[in-house]
């Protein structure tokens, strides 16, 4: 007997062919001998089966001796042996309907687990293989699990169900809810305006939730909440904000925060959390602020940085177009009795300048000018 695999919710066409290429008497029955559909001359007739409103045929094929049974919106329980009776012959087709669904939701937070469950008819013994968008293969039986979802797991998962040497393919779109970057560093000179951006790695029709930015300043003993906000249908509204610093927040996505000026006391690291409606868990993004200050006090030219810098970063002081006078893997460098001219303070990583501050040193009889 012929085996046909179908997908839950899909449409399947079971074929039945007569030797005569013309419209003749036919009918389809299920394994309980209940009539599904057939013809009375050129007219379609339907029997009392549970498929009644989902069973169909195609009139134009009858003249060619083809009498298909089309079943729409397939259900697992439609799995059965279907019999086509035509020309005193019986053609049997075994239909097996499978369904593959993701646990609870297809929108999952980064780090959560994805479970795919296969619905299959009694008596079947299918195998399932799924391929993630990043090419990772997982195999299993009735359930497949992937723990610790990553951002690269977002996209279309292709799952193949194998039964009786036949296969049926499912495509499931998974959205991993996360920020585009897990962490970011902003380098600023003292007094400059600071822009923090928290772009999301996904798009959804409606986005509702609430968030908060906690900040641990390098100079402070404990962290404090700088701002709390609500998100409703992609519109941002601030609930509470500290007086110092007085952050400003954009009203639309992506989440955008502005610190009026970078000051050494603000240097440090923050953690933005976003709790989404109907989701357990939160999205996190770390943000770091490094602040640079260059000063001249009497005969001492000093350059300092505050905030989370890596030990391999180099801090240098150099006179413009000259070799560095001082260069150290430290957070402060200085030059005593600096020559007059434009001095540059540079924070660099493997030769790449991350932050630069210029200070003009005047001849000793005048006071310094900071451009």
């Amino acid at each position: 007997k012929k085996v046909v695999l179908g997908k839950k919710g899909d449409t399947v066409e079971l074929t039945c062919t007569a030797s005569q290429k013309k419209s003749i008497q036919f009918h389809w029955k299920n394994s309980n001998q209940i009539k599904i559909l057939g013809n009375q001359g050129s007219f379609l007739t339907k029997g009392p089966s549970k498929l009644n409103d989902r069973a169909d045929s195609r009139r134009s094929l009858w003249d060619q001796g083809n009498f298909p049974l089309i079943i729409k919106n397939l259900k697992i329980e439609d799995s059965d042996t279907y019999i086509c009776e035509v020309e005193d012959q019986k053609e049997e087709v075994q239909l097996l309907v499978f369904g593959l669904t993701a646990n609870s939701d297809t929108h999952l937070l980064q780090g959560q687990s994805l479970t795919l469950t296969l619905e299959s008819p009694p008596g079947s013994s299918p195998s399932v293989q799924c391929r993630s968008p990043r090419g990772k293969n997982i195999q299993g039986g009735k359930t497949l699990s992937v723990s610790q979802l990553e951002l690269q797991d977002s996209g279309t998962w292709t799952c193949t169900v194998l039964q009786n040497q036949k296969k049926v393919e499912f495509k499931i779109d998974i959205v991993v809810l996360a920020f585009q970057k897990a962490s970011s560093i902003v380098y600023k000179k003292e007094g400059e305006q600071v822009e923090f951006s928290f772009p999301l790695a996904f798009t959804v029709e409606k986005l509702t939730g609430s968030g908060e930015l906690w900040w641990q300043a390098e100079r402070a003993s404990s962290s404090k909440s700088w701002i709390t906000f609500d998100l409703k249908n992609k519109e941002v509204s601030v609930k509470r904000v500290t007086q110092d610093p007085k952050l400003q927040m954009g009203k639309k996505l992506p989440l955008h925060l502005t610190l009026p000026q970078a000051l050494p006391q603000y240097a440090g690291s923050g953690n933005l959390t976003l709790a989404l409606e109907a989701k357990t868990g939160k999205l996190h993004q770390e943000v770091n602020l490094v602040v640079m200050r260059a000063t001249q006090l009497q005969k001492n030219l000093t350059c300092e940085v505050w905030g989370p810098t890596s030990p391999k970063l180099m801090l240098s002081l150099k006179l413009e177009n000259k070799e560095a006078k001082v260069s150290k893997r430290e957070k402060a460098v200085w030059v005593l009795n600096p020559e007059a001219g434009m001095w540059q303070c540079l924070l660099s990583d493997s030769g790449q300048v991350l932050l630069e501050s210029n200070i003009k040193v005047l001849p000793t009889w005048s006071t310094p000018v900071q451009p």
């Epitope: 419209s23 009375q40 050129s42 007219f43 379609l44 007739t45 169909d56 009139r59 134009s60 009858w62």
Partner: antibody
């Protein structure tokens, strides 16, 4: 050639019954279903039911169920349609028509049934 | 019951015109649709079955299209003998209902 010849016009009183005949010729009578369709004066077509002359099986439109009976006489290749409990709105031309593999391809000439008190 | 709705209910056209009549089913009927032509005092005549198959002997200026719920009968170049009333009928589910008809008249 294929022909369906129907009985003549009838005038009936409300509550009475009418029996219209349809004699088939020019084809194998048992091979084709026969449908009955009526048309009230100045109105559209209304499907009433079908009969399989081979098995005698019938299928009627729900609105005529209990009032219509379709029978056949294989010896004379004739199909009959009887409509009972006649009312004035049953005044119409009644057609028999042969169903083939393509569709309802041959029609009788029609029988006018007038219901009037 | 499946309702069949034809439009327009009547139209005026001239010889040589292209005429289109539509028929809409209240639910999907796949391609189980027939078109008939009826002239005054005569029995209907089958033109098209299975939505688009021309009945033997019917001129090729008649054509049908559609599937599901929306169907069309087209007469590519109207001839004097085509002035009549046209009916669609679904052969999908009992009762096998007809449309209310479209009368094609001479302009």
């Amino acid at each position: 050639q294929v022909q369906l010849v129907q009985s003549g016009a009838e005038v009936k009183k409300p509550g009475a019954s009418v029996k219209v005949s349809c004699k088939a010729s020019g084809y194998t009578f048992s091979d084709h279903h026969v449908h009955w369709v009526r048309q009230a004066p100045g109105q559209g077509l209304e499907w009433m039911g079908w009969m399989n002359p081979d098995s005698g099986n019938t299928g009627y439109a729900q609105r005529f169920q209990g009032r219509v009976t379709m029978t056949r006489d294989t010896s004379t290749s004739t199909v009959y349609m009887e409509l009972s409990s006649l009312r004035s709105e049953d005044t119409a031309v009644y057609y028999c028509a042969r169903d083939s593999t393509s569709g309802v391809d041959y029609w009788g000439q029609g029988t006018l049934v007038t219901v009037s008190s | 019951d499946i309702q069949m709705t034809q439009s327009p209910s009547s139209l005026s056209a001239s010889v040589g015109d292209r005429v289109t009549i539509t028929c809409r089913a209240s639910q999907s009927i796949s391609d189980f649709l027939n078109w008939y032509q009826q002239k005054p005092g005569k029995a209907p005549k089958l033109l098209i079955y299975a939505a688009s198959t021309l009945q033997s002997g019917v001129p090729s200026r008649f054509s049908g299209s559609g599937s599901g719920t929306d169907f069309t009968l087209t007469i590519s170049s109207l001839q004097p003998e085509d002035f009549a009333t046209y009916y669609c009928q679904q052969s999908y589910s009992s009762p096998y209902t007809f449309g209310q008809g479209t009368k094609v008249e001479i302009k």
